[in-house]
């Protein structure tokens, strides 16, 4: 969590005489009690007693797993990728049986030359990682291959990868139109059949921080939301401070319940505080409000 909430504790004495400290916080959450061996612990909300303490499940914490965290760790991948399945027809190489065998010298040489050619074609695309030949077949050489793209995760990663796939299409179309055989000879590193270029399929990494946040928040899914800071997503409840969605409890403490975030107002030596945001103070000695 980005912030820790101090919890006052009450001492309970177990039947064996040992003392267990449990947070004395009133929270309307479902309660399940985990009993392991002789050790009876009040591990609520699916938490379990490991012999020393309650091991809580997300999104709970506290000595009895009775409190809801203010933020949940969500970890987007550092990089996201796209894979484009393409087919091109190379006319400057005649198909031979050796090309079927991926461990043959011929295949290795073809793979090296094809990779060099594609590296030239796609130079200038920052997301371009490389190509991977999946199959070679007759006609002259029909090259089934994957173009691999990768970029740093940002909230706009899909747009970046979609744009990159469009540039790949443009560049492969251009090269297979321009680098063609003349008089049965090719002057380029490789020549192509213009009509043999096809994009079969495009697969883009799917990552949705909102979905991950909702899944991890479980029954609190409606109250946790994703906010970005420095392009990094944070899964927060309104009780997490420092975000646009943060709830200001003024003279009180924010606490999550199954009905959402609420403010628990404090009473000081001089004032009672009330109101939804604990912003209405009543002086104890003089009974008038001031805002």
């Amino acid at each position: 969590p980005l912030a820790t909430i101090p919890v006052s504790t009450t001492s309970l004495t177990s039947s064996e005489g040992s003392t267990i400290s449990t947070p004395s916080v009133d929270i309307s959450t479902p309660v399940t009690t985990s009993i392991v061996g002789d050790q009876c612990s009040r591990c609520k909300n699916g938490g379990f007693w490991d012999g020393l303490k309650c091991q809580c499940l997300t999104p709970y914490y506290g000595e009895s797993c009775e409190e809801v965290v203010n933020s949940i760790d969500i970890a987007p991948p550092e990089t996201v990728s796209a894979q484009m399945e393409l087919t091109v027809t190379v006319t400057s190489v005649k198909f031979t049986d050796e090309l079927k065998n991926h461990s043959s010298q011929e295949f290795r040489e073809f793979n090296k030359t094809f990779t060099e050619q594609m590296n030239i074609v796609y130079s200038g695309i920052p997301e371009y990682v490389g190509v991977n030949i999946t199959n070679l077949r007759l006609g002259s050489v029909v090259v089934e291959h994957d173009v691999l793209l990768r970029t740093k995760y940002t909230p706009e990663y899909k747009t970046a990868l979609d744009n990159a796939t469009e540039v790949v299409k443009q560049k492969i179309t251009k090269v297979t139109t321009e680098q063609i055989m003349t008089n049965d000879n090719c002057s380029a590193l490789m020549c192509f059949n213009t009509t043999g270029t096809q994009v079969q399929n495009i697969t883009v990494t799917q990552y949705d921080p909102v979905e991950e946040c909702r899944q991890k928040a479980e029954e609190y899914e409606d109250y946790f939301l994703v906010e970005y800071r420095d392009q990094k997503p944070y899964c927060i409840s309104p009780c997490e401070s420092g975000f646009n969605a943060s709830k200001n409890c003024n003279h009180g403490k924010c606490q999550m319940s199954q009905n959402g975030a609420r403010c628990l107002c404090v009473t000081t030596e001089t004032h009672w505080y009330s109101g939804e945001d604990c912003n209405q103070g009543t002086q104890k000695s003089h009974h008038h409000h001031h805002h």
């Epitope: 190489v93 031979t96 073809f110 030359t113 002057s187 380029a188």
Partner: nanobody
Framework: DVQLQASGGGSVQSGGSLRLSCAAS????????MAWFRQAPGREREGVAF???????SYAESVKGRFTISRDNALSTLWLQMNSLKPEDTGMYYC?????????????????WGQGTQVTVSS
Amino acid sequence: DVQLQASGGGSVQSGGSLRLSCAASGFPSSRGTMAWFRQAPGREREGVAFINSDGRTSYAESVKGRFTISRDNALSTLWLQMNSLKPEDTGMYYCAASLLYLMTVNAAAYPYWGQGTQVTVSS
């Protein structure tokens, strides 16, 4: 490991002849493509003549009818018979090879190269 050794270069008068040879070791002689390239001082390497495993040949326009490429698979040797030589044929001649059946005159497509043999044609 493929190794190519070119020889047969020399100095000749315009109109004369030379026969270049290239001994290939570690190269499956019945497969792929063998070629001759040349490079004149200050110029790019250019394809001169090409021969495929099935005997298909192709030539640069500038040497057609004057140069003949051939290969002996049994001897793993490549030849270039050069007749009616001209001063513009002067340069370093290299033999090159690929395990692939290539139809490209681009030097970058050929991974295996011999050291050059110098041909000088004076007028």
